[in-house]
């Protein structure tokens, strides 16, 4: 037999079907010009010493072969003895290691069999009514196709599906969408209405994420507040990566899950912007404010479930950093300025009340005064911190107040509002005899003592009504009792107590009269 002809004899190898899983497959035959034809196939398994034979049976029952050698592609003309106008059945037999491996047959009319391409270029993937919709441009001059898809998950083998007939410049396919696992899809096409035409190769993989992105399983820790008033948020546990099917491993555009960090600064609600979204890889520095942090996972189909944490405010206080002066016109606060052109947010809320009741005020950008201080003033009429109660004050600073992650904490402290000197006056002052020349003075704690760091000391004043001599005794802010000694029997005394803050003298309590009775011996 001539090599260019199909040889109408039995092939030159013994007859021994291996029945093995390897061997030739995916046989495709088509016309490539007016009088030439090509068949190509794939061979799975070791290729050393393999000889391939293209077999063909005509409608007459005659059968022949082409010897392809080690090649997996063979061309022949319409003069090779194979009928091109009538239906023929072709298959490949591969002879190797004393056994024959056979491909599945294709039955077709060669003249009408055109080489079809798989979807080429960009395959657009979208979600439609709980299903996956794929769309692509029809390859040039190939309108009219049957389309199939195959898909697999990381744990399942290929499953075949049908896209139905296509007859337009764009083709599309509805495929199943998995809720929780990624899928790999491939598509192939063949000529529509041509009996037995060969399928194209499979397209490049189309990698599709699950409908629901995986819920982020991450943990955060937050560092101590630094000298600069900022603390770093760190990721303790990276989110788990999505398991991918074989063909999507490595480079898998389409299956990416992006994790974003959404910060919501709960403190200082009067600032311009309360939320900011960042990439999870870029862990921010935060002020000492309270925050809600959400990790949002999303893929090409949109966001999934998020995981939310609350980061409480840093409650470390600086009792001396804030000076407050109360005048007739109002109140002014002074604190060490951070830098030039800083915006400050002053936030206050009554102690022991819900954080939602915080009030705040935003200053215009300000430079330090000659003493290096920043200031904030308010009038009595404004009502700010006007009630006689304890307030927790936090001051935040930023050179870029519109950027949520650039705020820092300047200080946190306590302040007693209203007329603190009067409100702080100790009540229920009582005097008890202690010895022949001493008394014990007790009083109820000042309201100022409810405000950590505000009460500097108590002062107890004792006045000798005869000599008009006055003595004053400082008492620790944690004490509410003092012993006055060196007193004389029969002399009238008055005692008063006041409560002082670091910047304000208190108002004396009502004078309390007492005397030590003269002891008469029997």
């Amino acid at each position: 037999c001539r090599t260019s002809e199909c040889c109408f004899q039995d092939p030159p190898y013994p007859d021994a079907d291996s029945g093995s899983a390897s061997g030739p497959r995916d046989l495709r035959c088509y016309r490539i010009s007016s009088d030439r034809y090509e068949c190509s196939w794939q061979y799975e398994g070791p290729t050393a010493g393999v000889s391939h034979f293209l077999r063909c049976c005509l409608s007459s029952g005659r059968c022949c072969y082409f010897a392809a050698g080690s090649a997996t592609r063979l061309q022949f003309s319409d003069q090779a003895g194979v009928s091109v106008l009538y239906t023929v059945t072709l298959w490949v037999e591969s002879w190797a290691r004393n056994q024959t491996e056979k491909s599945p047959e294709v039955t077709l009319q060669l003249y009408n069999s055109v080489k079809y391409e798989p979807p080429l270029g960009d395959i657009k993937v979208s979600k439609l009514a709980g299903q996956l919709r794929m769309e692509w441009e029809t390859p040039d001059n190939q309108v009219g196709a049957e389309v199939q898809f195959r898909h697999r998950t990381p744990s399942s083998p290929w499953k075949l599906g049908d896209c139905g007939p296509q007859d337009d410049d764009t083709e599309s396919c509805l495929c199943p969408l998995e809720m929780n696992v990624a899928q790999e899809f491939q598509l192939r096409r063949r000529q529509l209405g041509s009996q037995g035409s060969s399928w194209s190769k499979w397209s490049s993989p189309v990698c599709v994420p699950p409908e629901n992105p995986p819920q982020p399983q991450v943990r955060f820790s937050v560092e101590q507040l630094g000298q600069d008033g900022r603390r770093r948020l760190t990721l303790k546990e990276q989110p788990t990566q999505l398991e991918l099917p074989e063909g999507c491993q490595g480079l898998a555009p389409g299956t990416e899950v992006t994790y974003r960090l959404q910060l919501h600064m709960l403190s200082c609600p009067c600032k311009a912007k309360a939320t900011r979204t960042l990439h999870l890889g870029k862990m921010p520095y935060l002020s000492g404010a309270a925050y809600n942090v959400a990790v949002i996972s999303s893929n090409q189909f949109g966001p999934g479930l998020n995981q939310t944490w609350h980061i409480p405010a840093d409650t470390h206080t600086e009792p001396v950093a804030l000076n407050i002066s109360v005048g007739t016109n109002g109140t002014t606060m002074y604190w060490p300025a951070r830098a030039q052109s800083m915006t400050y947010c002053i936030e206050w809320q009554p102690v022991g009340q819900d954080g939602g009741l915080a009030t705040c005020s935003l200053t215009a950008p300000q430079d330090p005064d000659p003493a290096g201080m920043a200031t904030y003033s308010w009038s009595r009429e404004s009502g700010a911190m006007g009630q006689e109660k304890c307030y927790y004050i936090t001051i935040f600073a930023s050179a870029h107040p519109e950027k949520l992650t650039l705020w820092s904490t300047v200080l946190s402290t306590y302040h007693f509002g209203g007329n603190a000197s009067a409100a702080g006056t100790p009540h229920h002052v009582s005097v008890k005899n202690h010895s022949l020349d001493s008394v014990s003075v007790d009083w109820a704690p000042s309201l100022l003592s409810t405000c950590p760091g505000v009460l500097k000391e108590y002062v107890v004043r004792c006045r000798d009504e005869d000599s008009k001599q006055v003595s004053e005794h400082p008492v620790q802010p944690t004490e509410t009792q003092v012993t006055l000694s060196g007193l004389r029997a029969g002399v009238a005394y008055t005692v008063q107590v006041r409560a002082d803050t670091a910047w304000l003298r208190g108002v004396w309590s009502q004078p309390q009269r007492f005397s030590i009775e003269v002891q008469v011996s029997d």
């Epitope: 109408f8 039995d10 007859d15």
Partner: nanobody
């Protein structure tokens, strides 16, 4: 000279079975692949199945796969076609064919009808 004689055809109901036989003589039967072809009324020849010389390789046209089985007995110079789950569209004259030179017998009629 080469001779092929088919037998075993007949009338059968849809879903029924038949076994066609082909007795070969006048050539070295065990050295050649063999085919079955058929011709339905008013239509051209249609290849159905092929079996290699030793019987190790068998091939079928799509529309009979899983229903028909080709086999041979080289010791008896016999070719067979077992046909199950027959359908009305299988009605035709069936011929056995010497796959190398295309010689065929006179055929056997298979009619599938209720």
């Amino acid at each position: 000279q080469l001779q092929l004689v088919e037998s075993g055809g007949g009338l059968v109901q849809p879903g029924g079975s038949l076994r066609l036989s082909c007795a070969a003589s006048g050539f070295t039967f065990s050295s050649y692949g063999m085919s079955w072809v058929r011709q339905a009324p008013g239509k051209g020849l249609e290849w159905v199945s092929y079996i290699s010389a030793g019987g190790g390789t068998t091939t079928y046209v799509d529309f009979v796969k899983g229903r028909f089985t080709i086999s041979r007995d080289n010791a008896k110079n016999m070719l067979y076609l077992q046909m199950n789950s027959l359908k009305p569209e299988d009605t035709a004259v069936y011929y056995c064919v010497h796959a190398a030179d295309g010689s065929r017998g006179q055929g056997t009629q298979v009619t599938v009808s209720s």
